[in-house]
Each structure stands twice: as C-alpha cells, then as structure tokens.
Interface confidence: low
C-alpha cells in the first residue's frame, strides 16, 4: 500500500505572503499573476510516495510536461537546489546517473520523466515531511523546478488518493476559453499593483507551513516571471534533514561531473541542450546521446565513487513488454 | 509484443506527397520517442530525424529540415513522415524506430525497428 | 558531423573463424551502438552501450571500443551471422551511421 501525494507545479506562493497585503486583496493577485506569468509555460510535477511496507523508503517521481529537451534533471531534498536543497540525484541524457546516499536507485522512466528509489535508516533517512524537488534543465525554456512531500497527515497504512490540486495546463488553458479571463485579469492586476504602489510598503512575513499551504510551486519559472514576481526563495520547513553534506557529496566519481552546467536556466545552449524545430536554432544544431528529452541517460562505462548503476542483465527494459507510467 | 508496423510500398511521381504511418503496438505510445531512418537502395542508413511522442516536437537535422515532416495520432498509437515535393532522391525504405527509453538506465538506441516502407520516386 | 567510417566494407569469414568488425569515428563518441541488418529485412539493436549485447544475440558477439575506435567481434561466426552490421553514435547531432560492414560466410 502506498500513500501518495501528487504535486504539480504550478501553485500560489506560501499562505505566509498573504499577511502582505491581506486576504481579500491579495489572493485574487496572485492567482492571477502566477496564471499572467506561466501561460504558455511548461509544467514540473512531482509525486512522492511512501511505502508501507518499508517506511523509510520513499520513490520520488518527477516529470518534465514541457516541449523543450530535457538536458538535465536534478532531485534534492530538503529545498529546491541551490536553496539549501541537498542534491539526491542528477541524471544526464548524455553521461549518465549519478546518485548520493540514500538515494538508492535513479533511472529514466520515460521520454520525460525520471524516479528515484530513496531508503534510509538513521541519520540519513528521510522522513514523512521531508521536502523533495526536481529541477529539469530544458532548451529552450531553460529551468524548471518543483517541489513536493509527503502531507503532514500521511499514514503509510492507508491508500491515500493523491493530493488534489489544480494544474494550470497552457494548452487546456486556451482550449477552455482562459484567454480572455487572462488578459482581463492581468489588466486588473496592473491596475490592483498601481493601487498597491501608493500604499506603504508591507513587510514580508516568513513563510509558514500549514496543513493548507501548498507543497510545491515553479521555483525560478524564467528570468522574466522571476523579475515579474520578486519574490525570494521562500523554502518549506522541514524537521527532517539529511545527516551531513558530506555523506551526500562524496568527493571523486566521473569526470563529468566538473562539467556539468552549475546553472542550466542561464546556459540552455550549453553542451546538454538540443535543438528542435519549432525554435529558430542559434548556431548549429546542437544535440546530446539520445534525444529525449529528454528521454534518456546513457551509463557511464565504469562504476566510480558515487556512481552507482544499475545494468539490467536483460538488456533494455523497454524489450520486456509494454511500459507505461505507473 | 512490441511491434511497429508500417504501411505498404509507395509509388510517386515526382513533386507529389507522400505519408508513411507508423503503427505502435505492445508498449504505451507517449512513453518513447519515435526515430524516423532513411535507407537508400544499395546504402546505409541515415537518421532524419524524431519526434517527441508526449509533446509532439520534431527535431531534424540539417540534411531533413523542409520537405519532411513528422506527425501523431496519439489516440492510434501512430506515427507519420510526410514527404513533400518528392524528388528521385527520395526513392528509399524509410524505417521508423523506436527510442529506447526507460531502461534501467535510459538509453538513445533505437531497440524496436518498423517494418519499412519502400518509396519508390519515378516520372 | 561526426563521420563513422566502417571497416572492412565486406568481410568473408569461414565458419569458427573470430571475426572483428572495425568502427572509427571523426571526432570521439561515448558509446557505440551497432545494429544487425540482413537482406530484405528491418535492422535490428546488436549490441548497444558499446558492449553490451541486446536480447536475444548469442554470447559469442562482443563489443567494445572507446574515444573514435570501436569494434565488433563474433569469437566463432556461425551461418546466421551473415548480415551487415552498421555501427551508430548518439553523442552528438546528427546521429550518424557507419556505412556498414557486409559479412558474407565461406
């Protein structure tokens, strides 16, 4: 039995800024300005999942509902990456899986989605309200990241339905007709930002986590929506942390590593990015072992510290029958 | 069992169009990209290109970018190419292959091949 | 783009005999891939991750390989090994194949 909590990105900041401006004016603002600044953007969804019969052990999936190729993904936990996240696992299209305690097994589970196995006891064992986030490099949307856990009331005995929540879609957007909401509603969040403008300035409160607070939401969907929103990494409380950096960084593993883009959201034309038609290619067309967006990651030819593989002795699983997304 | 199947030999005049379906079967559709592979009489084979089975992106390379196309009929499970303005030069099987995703690891080989679609280009 | 050149173009092997195909490419690749062609028929993964042999190839087909030199070798070629065998790169766009090896049996 599995207890799950699905998460899609795309969500209103923490309940904590609403003390900002206060609840009438605020809400509608923001639902608004989040659907302003990702229209037409891709989506990062995130499920995390608890099994019962081992309740140290999580698996994470995280998938990539955008256009562009996938050139990087990056799981962590505890925050988003660079936020005071610590990295579980990178998968490359091109060089590969590499992985730190507990994470136990990463792999690709289809053109654009990846899971990851976590197990643990002790110190460097998650725990139900750990906070895990996967960050997927693109080109040529550049970064995308999303956040998830566990709900505070999980109970790994029960079979719980995924958490409901809206998933703003783009497409189904503009096929319901949101268009026009949208447009109407960006003017009149111009006009509620100008009234705001001549109001002194509130003070931010912390971000709180609450049984109603959102879990997740696009961290840095672009530099412009980051420009548009101004709004701080705000990163969810968590009593549940990894033991030390160190067992997680473990120093040596394949040189790729160095290589690696630090910052994959400014640099979507980096050596891991490819091209595809419907964007005008700057340059030439630039492309990584396997195309998949994203879709894939080839294993590194030798198994260094850190490294961990997992080589099916079948051969490729995609031979065994029919794959779909569980 | 995984199959690709395609459609039947073609025959086309010069400056007309023609489609080749792909039909997937044994496996979930949108999970793996689709390759499209070119392969002249008496040659080797050249990658035109793929396109992205959840998102419907194509990609091509330089040598395919114009004439070619790719297209989905998710709900069939099929794949197209579309040739326009045929030249004799396009007289060749054309293969469509799957991207082996989701292997323990992940991979880009092509690890199911379609049955191949001869086109035959003549005034 | 990164040209694969395939060596030799036809080889003829008697039965038993260890055979090995060569790959080289332009510019280095992080693994190779070759794919097992025979006449009037669809080409099928052989070996895949420079050495590792698909589903279904018998034990006595390796592969192994790296930077721009890659092979192929059949420890004891038997009759259904008579086919053309295509060696292919993923690490940089476009993908590209070798011209192939045709391996005809004595």
């Known amino acids: 039995m599995r207890t799950e909590a699905q998460v899609p990105a795309l969500q209103p900041p923490e309940p904590g800024l609403e003390g900002a401006m206060g609840h009438r004016t605020l809400v509608l603002p923001w639902v608004l300005l989040t659907l302003c600044v990702t229209a037409g953007t891709p989506e990062v969804w995130v499920q995390v999942r608890m099994e019962a019969t081992e309740l140290s052990s999580f698996t994470i999936r995280c998938g990539f509902l955008g256009s562009g190729s996938i050139s990087l993904v990056t799981v962590s936990w505890g925050g988003p990456n660079g936020a005071g996240g610590t990295t579980l696992a990178v998968l490359h299209p091109e060089r590969g899986i590499r992985q730190w305690a507990p994470a136990r097994q990463a792999r690709w589970e289809t053109q654009s989605s990846i899971s990851l196995i976590l197990e643990g006891s002790g110190a460097s064992s998650p725990c139900a309200n750990t906070t895990f986030c996967c960050k997927f490099a693109s080109f040529p949307e550049g970064s995308w990241e999303a956040c998830g856990s566990l709900p505070p009331s999980s109970d790994p005995g029960l079979s719980a339905p995924p958490t409901p929540a809206p998933i703003l879609r783009a497409d189904l957007a503009g096929i319901l007709g949101v268009s026009g909401v949208l447009l109407f509603g960006c003017v009149y969040l111009l006009h509620l930002l100008r009234r705001h403008k001549h109001r002194p300035a509130p003070r931010l409160q912390p971000s709180r986590t609450s049984p109603q607070a959102p879990r997740a939401r696009a961290w840095a969907p672009s530099q412009a929506s980051q420009a548009a929103l101004h709004v701080p990494y705000a990163t969810i409380n968590t009593s549940c942390r990894p033991a030390t950096l160190d067992t997680a960084h473990p120093h040596g593993g394949p040189s790729w590593w160095a290589s690696l883009p630090t910052h994959a959201a400014h640099r979507p034309q980096g050596p891991a990015a490819w091209a595809s038609t419907p964007i005008p290619a700057r340059g030439s067309f630039v492309s990584v072992e396997n195309g998949l967006y994203a879709q894939a990651g080839e294993r590194p030819p030798h198994t260094g510290p850190g490294l961990t593989l997992f080589p099916d002795p079948r051969g490729p699983r995609a031979m065994e029958g029919p794959l779909g997304v569980r | 069992q995984i199959q690709l199947v395609q459609s039947g030999p073609d025959l086309k005049k010069p400056g007309e169009t023609v489609k080749i379906s792909c039909k997937a079967s044994?496996?979930?559709?949108?999970?793996?990209?689709m390759s499209w592979v070119k392969q002249a009489p008496g040659r080797g084979l050249k990658w035109m290109g793929w396109i992205n089975t959840y998102s419907g992106v194509s990609t091509f390379p330089d040598d395919f970018k114009g004439r070619f196309a790719f297209s989905l009929e998710t709900s069939a499970s099929t794949a197209y190419l579309q040739i326009n303005n045929l030249k004799n030069e396009d007289s060749a099987t054309y293969f469509c292959a799957r991207l082996g995703m989701g292997s323990t690891t992940g991979a880009g080989y092509f690890d199911v091949w379609g049955t191949g679609t001869t086109v035959t280009v003549s005034s | 783009e990164n040209v694969l050149t395939q060596s030799p173009a036809i080889m003829s092997a008697s039965l038993g005999e260890k055979v090995t195909l060569s790959c080289r490419a332009s510019s280095s690749v992080n693994y190779m891939y070759w794919y097992q062609q025979k006449s009037d028929a669809s080409p099928k993964l052989w070996i895949y991750?420079?050495?590792n042999l698909a589903p279904g190839v018998p034990a006595r087909f390796s592969g192994s390989g790296s930077g721009n030199s890659y092979s192929l070798t059949i420890s004891s070629v038997e009759g259904e090994d008579a086919a053309t065998y295509y060696c292919?790169?993923?690490?940089?766009?476009?993908?590209?194949f070798g011209g192939g090896t045709k391996l005809e049996i004595k």
């Open positions: 292919q790169q993923f690490t940089s766009s476009p993908w590209t």
């Open positions: 991750y420079t050495s």
């Open positions: 044994g496996y979930t559709f949108t999970t793996y990209g």
